[in-house]
Amino acid sequence: KTLVLGKEGESAELPCESSQKKITVFTWKFSDQRKILGQHGKGVLIRGGSPSQFDRFDSKKGAWEKGSFPLIINKLKMEDSQTYICELENRKEEVELWVFKVTANSDTHLLQGQSLTLTLESPPGSSPSVQCRSPRGKNIQGGKTLSVSQLELQDSGTWTCTVLQNQKKVEFKIDIVVLAFQKASSIVYKKEGEQVEFSFPLAFTVEKLTGSGELWWQAERASSSKSWITFDLKNKEVSVKRVTQDPKLQMGKKLPLHLTLPQALPQYAGSGNLTLALEAKTGKLHQEVNLVVMRATQLQKNLTCEVWGPTSPKLMLSLKLENKEAKVSKREKAVWVLNPEAGMWQCLLSDSGQVLLESNIKVLPTWSTPVQP
């Protein structure tokens, strides 16, 4: 018995070869002897039943001259798994067809952190092994059900599942979309008074995107968090539902989600959490955003530089006179210089020598007031 493996919805070719390598009479039948199709000597394909019943069955007329009389079954169904008989030159050849199906649980669009379950459906009597490879090259294998918990962004893409049965294999490709923001977290560094831009690009594209979202903000100076903005998303169009009066945020109506804050102020420095609930999906997408604000001031004989917001302890805050060595440099959120000499002073927030934020302040001779460029 020859074994042929097929995939549900696709086509399978069941072989039947003549020893004479020329056109001859042949008939394909089901195991219960019902006729499917054949050729009775006139080079014409004759079907065994009504067209609607047998429209999925065909042969390759171009191969007949070479002594090959395959049975082509299109749009395979699980119930096509059975034995087929090819009658040719007073002999019968049995071909066993096993149709397999691999499906993803409920949906192929899953939120980051959710689980993916791949299920193999196989015909009775078969004992296949299955191995699936993720887009990032991770292999998982098991029985009829394979599970991956805590899906990550890198799991988006084509999963390849190989079903092995009697040394024969059939490959399934399943496109999985992990719904997530491109970045889990981002940090924005701004001088006091500058405009602030927050962008929340999605890591996936879908034809129609509908849902609702909200940005909650925990200011460093505040005891509790506050909702800054709520919005709806319909077919990729953003419409603001409610926005706080302070700060007065602006939000773009096109994707990617984009917000602007008219100016960076110490009272806004802190952390935000943007959540997006998508229609027909359980759970929400999250992106954290952080705002660090710098202010340089001179009050009488004291030049001060301060930062507000979530800074790492390894960040260095420095005050230096332009083109000179730093006068003061500390792993703190405020530094100052008493009786600063006249000139352009720079306040720098840096991480391992890389400047993240810079604010300049001009110190005039003692009889004048300072100028902030």
């Epitope: 405009q195 319909k234 169009e237 602006q250 773009g252």
Partner: antibody, heavy 119, light 107 residues
């Protein structure tokens, strides 16, 4: 071919009402965002009101909020602007404009209809 | 609402000149900006969308640039038919707002 044809303009007294219509053809009206833009004599362009194609949300300039109502009749492929409590400063040519598919500007405009508010 | 400040308000130039018009937004608007040309008694015409994309059928002498808050419309070599009034429009969010316009006249 895309066509936008405004009608309904005319002379109206201050405090009066008027309804402008814009008959649209040549594109999928039901899914397109549409707007009304006006131009007072000798002045610049002013965006007045818009309606979203995807969700039917309506939007207004502060100068007309509470007095004007934008709406659409998808079965008739027609956009409307209901103008109430009209003032002299509402005197302008009113244009109906179609937004590009992905909301990047107005790619088609009507010829405009003149609304004059005067006693 | 987002304010759009367009400059200059008027400009005199000659055929063949290179002309630049600028527009500044009061808020960051990404590249959500269009440029329009209007001739007397006519409806406006879209020239540039998404700050730098040329609308179909518009001559390549028109170009747009910029992102964030500062935008520019450039006409590389003025043609007689280019003398008109030009407007920028932010379509970042509602309410949309136009710049005050730049009247381009023959010197």
């Amino acid at each position: 071919e895309v066509q936008l044809l405004e009608s309904g303009g005319g002379l109206v007294q201050p405090g009066g009402s008027l309804r402008l219509s814009c008959a649209a053809s040549g594109f999928t009206f039901s899914t397109n965002a549409m707007s009304w833009v006006r131009q007072a004599p000798g002045k610049g362009l002013e965006w007045v009101s818009g309606i979203s194609g995807s969700n039917g949300n309506t939007y207004y300039a502060d100068s007309v909020k509470g007095r004007f109502i934008i709406s659409r009749d998808i079965s008739k492929n027609t956009l409307y602007l209901e103008m109430n409590s009209l003032r002299a400063e509402d005197t302008a040519v009113y244009y109906c404009a179609k937004e590009r598919d992905n909301w990047n500007g107005f790619d088609y405009w009507g010829q405009g209809t003149l609304v004059t508010v005067s006693s | 609402a987002i304010q759009m400040t367009q400059s200059p308000s008027s400009l005199s130039a000659s055929v063949g000149d290179r002309v630049t018009i600028t527009c500044r937004a009061s808020h960051v608007i990404r590249n959500d900006l269009g440029w329009y040309q209007q001739k007397p008694g006519k409806a406006p015409k879209l020239l540039i969308y998404a700050a730098s994309s040329l609308q179909s059928g518009v001559p390549s002498r028109f170009s747009g640039s910029g992102s964030g808050t500062d935008f520019t419309l450039t006409i590389s070599s003025l043609q007689p038919e280019d003398f008109a009034t030009y407007y920028c429009l932010q379509d970042y969010n509602y309410p949309y707002t136009f710049g005050q316009g730049t009247k381009l006249e023959i010197k």
